[in-house]
């Protein structure tokens, strides 16, 4: 059976600045094309690594036990995780070198729960989004972003941390998910695949997109990331899918044009400040939201994920640059840096718009299978 056709006004149709086309039926895999949880990828399918908020700008996270090792926040995923693996297994490996920092990779040993027990939690990210099952929540208002249009100076740090490319954001970028739900942006990073292989973290009805951007935020209720980890709503991530379009995306080009300078793992450069909001879809009113986790160790839960319905368009050349320029650990290309989708375990994904509406003529009254939870509580 084919997946339902996505119309202009239906989930993930239409893109930033009206440049992208809605996803048509031909863009979506049939059921047999969809990745199967029971079919983990081979070794070559395993993505690289990943990391979280602000790196050395952030305080240490104290390890739960000796076995975990000293987990510093710079070792955390920028709210990201492993590849097309098909089990909720998250494996990490400890690098013998280095200064007692935890290093892990997708698909290696030891299993992630040994690095951080939270990785075996019940409410992990990323997840597969099924719009038909999303609960329409009229209480979910358009996102509000303030101060995201940065001037060229001061410059920002762009770093290849071995598992993603991360842009550290300056103070002053404020985001509100709704009244009383205020956050400050810390950093953004990307997830991608490899040639001909998509690499988004979240999926939509099993469809994986070429890439995904994450903008990581700290709740204003907390002064430090380590205080917020594991607390409900302590961290919030804005996520958007990146798709191929006919034109170069000038906002992304400001970052992608600099990747050659940081091809080597651990290298960094400075880039002019830019309009961070231009990296996101233009429609801040239509999104999916759920509570999940960081997508790499320490896999802390309580993270509010907001996944835009609208996608962002990059040219084929830009997507190739993203997936084919950077190098990760051990002389391997930094590719497929995404985590397998995790089970919802009863969680309900909310939508700020009626995502479950079937646009075909015979659909009279849409059936909403899930009811909206009290948003903003």
């Amino acid at each position: 059976q084919r997946l339902p056709r996505m119309q202009e006004d239906s989930p993930l149709g239409g893109g930033s600045s009206g440049e992208d086309d809605p996803l048509g039926e031909e863009d979506l895999p049939s059921e047999e094309d969809s990745p199967r949880e029971e079919d983990p990828p081979g070794e070559e399918d395993l993505p690289g690594e990943e990391d979280l908020p602000g790196e050395e700008d952030l305080p240490e996270v104290k390890p739960k036990s000796e076995e975990e090792g000293s987990l510093k926040l710079e070792d955390l995923p920028t709210v990201e995780a492993p590849g097309d693996p098909q089990e909720p297994q998250n494996n990490a490996h400890r690098d013998k070198e280095g200064d007692d920092q935890s290093h892990w990779r997708y698909g290696g040993d030891p299993p992630w729960p040994r690095v951080s027990p939270a990785c075996a939690g019940r409410f992990q990210s990323p997840v597969d989004i099924r719009p038909q099952l999303a609960a329409f929540c009229p209480a979910l208002r358009p996102l509000e972003l303030l101060g995201f249009q940065l001037p060229p100076l001061p410059e920002l740090r762009l770093r290849n941390n071995g598992h993603s490319v991360q842009l550290t954001l300056p103070p002053g970028l404020e985001m509100a998910l709704g009244p009383g739900r205020e956050y400050r942006a810390l950093q953004l990073h990307l997830h991608w695949g490899a040639a001909g292989r998509p690499g988004s973290e979240h999926t939509v009805e099993g469809h994986r997109f070429p890439a995904e951007i994450h903008v990581v935020h700290l709740s204003t209720a907390f002064a430090r990331v380590d205080e917020a980890l594991g607390r409900p709503g302590g961290l919030a991530v804005l996520a958007a899918f990146l798709e191929e379009g006919p034109e170069e995306n000038s906002a992304y080009e400001q970052l992608l044009s600099r990747l050659e300078e940081i091809a080597e793992e651990g290298s960094e450069t400075q880039v002019p400040g830019l309009d961070i909001s231009a990296l996101l879809p233009s429609d801040f009113s239509r999104y999916f939201q759920y509570e999940g986790s960081l997508t790499t160790p320490p896999c802390a839960q309580g993270v509010i994920w907001t996944v835009f319905n609208q996608t962002v368009m990059l040219s084929a050349k830009q997507l190739h640059t993203l997936s084919d320029t950077l190098w990760g650990p051990g002389d391997s290309r930094l590719q497929l840096n995404f985590r397998a989708t995790q089970p919802l375990n009863g969680r309900v994904i909310e939508a700020s718009f009626p995502a479950g509406v079937d646009s075909s003529p015979r659909a009279a009254e849409p059936v909403q299978l899930n009811s909206c939870l009290a948003a903003g509580d």
Partner: antibody, heavy 124, light 107 residues
Framework: EVQLVESGGGLVQPGGSLRLSCAAS????????MHWVRQAPGRGLEWVAF??????????QYSASVKGRFTISRDNAENSLYLQMNSLRAEDTAVYYC???????????????WGKGTTVTVSS | DIQMTQSPSSLSASVGDRVTITCHVS??????LSWYQQKPGEAPKLLIY???NLHTGVPSRFSGSGSGTDFTLTISSLQPEDFATYYC?????????FGQGTKLEIK
Amino acid sequence: EVQLVESGGGLVQPGGSLRLSCAASGFTFTDYYMHWVRQAPGRGLEWVAFIRNKASGYTPQYSASVKGRFTISRDNAENSLYLQMNSLRAEDTAVYYCVRGGHAGSNYWYFDVWGKGTTVTVSS
Amino acid sequence: DIQMTQSPSSLSASVGDRVTITCHVSQNINVWLSWYQQKPGEAPKLLIYQASNLHTGVPSRFSGSGSGTDFTLTISSLQPEDFATYYCQQGQSYPFTFGQGTKLEIK
């Protein structure tokens, strides 16, 4: 008085090298990004390179046309800016200006103080 | 790279005239644009920064406007010392680029 004075220009053969210097005075040199901008005879202005200020680690940035051939550096104790030019080509012939632009309080790059320039001629 | 296109390339005007020079940019640069004046044998001088801010010591007859991709430099009443070449420059991202220049000549 804020001042920039270039020196070191001259005639050089293709493939040769030259080192330009710029003496800065009248301002806190380490606070500023410093640039080289050139102008070929009868042509427009072309940005060549800059070196960041103290707050940004004094790292360099180059235009594609000179990357790998030119090296920008600064001596903060001497309030001096340099441009080492190697593998010179005929198309590098220009007046080279030392320019101040961008500091801790700036929000973008504009060039507010220019030296008088020094002429580099690359010819056999 | 960001492309800058000035128009006109040259312009003849008389003392007292109001003159407008435009600068079109290939992509949105917000207000990160500057204007410079250059006289023969001299270095350029900054006139306007951030699209509309007058640099210290520049006469008030000079003004700048615009944002995004289209910018304008206006001289409200031309003076003899204003005959020169004018350049726009984007400071949004490197490589920093300049317009090709507009030569303002006496009619």
